[in-house]
Amino acid sequence: KESCDVQLYIKRQSYHSIFAGDPFKLECPVKYCAHRPQVTWCKLNGTTCVKLEGRHTSWKQEKNLSFFILHFEPVLPSDNGSYRCSANFLSAIIESHSTTLYVTDVKSASERPSKDEMASRPWLLYS
């Protein structure tokens, strides 16, 4: 029998390389059975995850999964960092793994670096 617990399918140690000025959608894949849980996004500040209030979010439904989306319109240099989604389910909080956004300012980069370079060259990134 398949579990009816809520599950948040953000991959462990995942990251996204994005560019300031571009639009971006950060997706939190959510599996649930009967009732869709309340889901929120937060941004890590040290060991504390600060809830993101007043941001544009939406839901997308696919066959076996729903996605709670955080919209960046557009991406700002200050959006660099790690994010986590969490679901409120039966009075319990289920937290996802964090996913990291590496934001490059295209004005300071002569060419867009490769996806792997983004993760391995922190001096390109905003802290």
């Epitope: 991959k11 140690q13 995942s14 990251y15 390389s17 964090s98 996806k115 993760a119």
Partner: antibody, heavy 120, light 112 residues
Framework: QVQLQESGPGLVKPSGTLSLTCADS????????IHWVRQPPGKGLEWIGR????????RYNPSLKSRVTISSDKSKNQASLKLSSVTAADTAVYYC?????????????WGQGTTVTVSS | DIVMTQSPDSLALSLGERATINCKSS???????????LNWFQQKPGQPPKRLIY???KLDSGVPDRFSGSGSGTDFTLTISSVQAEDVAVYYC?????????FGQGTKLEIK
């Protein structure tokens, strides 16, 4: 049942490029990470790198980073490894492996491996 | 890079004896999520590695309970309580906490 199968030329000339493919059946590669690992004859295991096929993002072993490229094709449900400027030291069995999700986050399914010999 | 050092390099035991393989990492393997991604693999000749233990001590499904794992931080141990003929293999520890991922050099288990 997850099944991984590596394929590619068994013989590569020195200074050439080693190209291997990992075909996946039984799951969508976008749901997980695909890793490449190699094992020289009679020696231990060396992690080469991994790819997130959902977005193409990679992480590589710094000792190989300048020569290695891992890519994926979601439509074919497969991942690929390219290693350039090969020498005899790159002779090894090359494995692709799947990283499963919660709660393991480890290499749970491996291909049988393909032997690549670098020789003229 | 995280260096994983296994000891001993090889081990020859009689059937029924207890096998202990140690693995020491050069940095703590405790991840930011509070978990320790230390795994043990078994590799038999001509075969790919097979996962035995994940998260330090959790036994993979189908693995006999004579296998166990323990440890924390930087020091870890794989124990086979009573060695059987089918346990002849090379055993590797592997860390999945830091990049690059790294394996121990392997410990070869033989029967006397």
């Amino acid at each position: 049942q997850v099944q991984l199968q590596e394929s590619g030329p068994g013989l590569v000339k020195p200074s050439g490029t080693l190209s291997l493919t990992c075909a996946d059946s039984g799951f969508s590669i976008s749901d997980t990470y695909i890793h490449w690992v190699r094992q020289p004859p009679g020696k231990g295991l060396e992690w080469i790198g991994r790819i997130d096929p959902a977005n193409g993002f990679t992480r590589y072993n710094p000792s190989l980073k300048s020569r290695v490229t891992i890519s994926s094709d979601k439509s074919k449900n497969q991942a690929s490894l390219k290693l350039s400027s090969v020498t005899a030291a790159d002779t090894a069995v090359y494995y692709c492996a799947r990283e499963d999700g919660y709660p393991y986050y480890t290499l749970d399914s491996w291909g049988q491996g393909t032997t690549v010999t670098v020789s003229s | 890079d995280i260096v994983m050092t296994q000891s001993p390099d090889s081990l020859a035991l009689s059937l029924g004896e207890r096998a202990t393989i140690n693995c020491k990492s050069s940095q703590s393997l405790l991840d930011v999520d509070g978990k320790t991604y230390l795994n043990w693999f078994q590799q038999k000749p001509g075969q790919p590695p097979k996962r035995l233990i994940y998260l330090v001590s959790k036994l993979d499904s189908g693995v006999p309970d004579r296998f166990s794992g323990s440890g924390s931080g930087t020091d870890f141990t794989l124990t086979i309580s009573s060695v059987q003929a089918e346990d002849v293999a090379v055993y590797y520890c592997w860390q999945g906490t830091h990049f690059p991922r790294t394996f121990g050099q392997g410990t070869k288990l033989e029967i006397k």
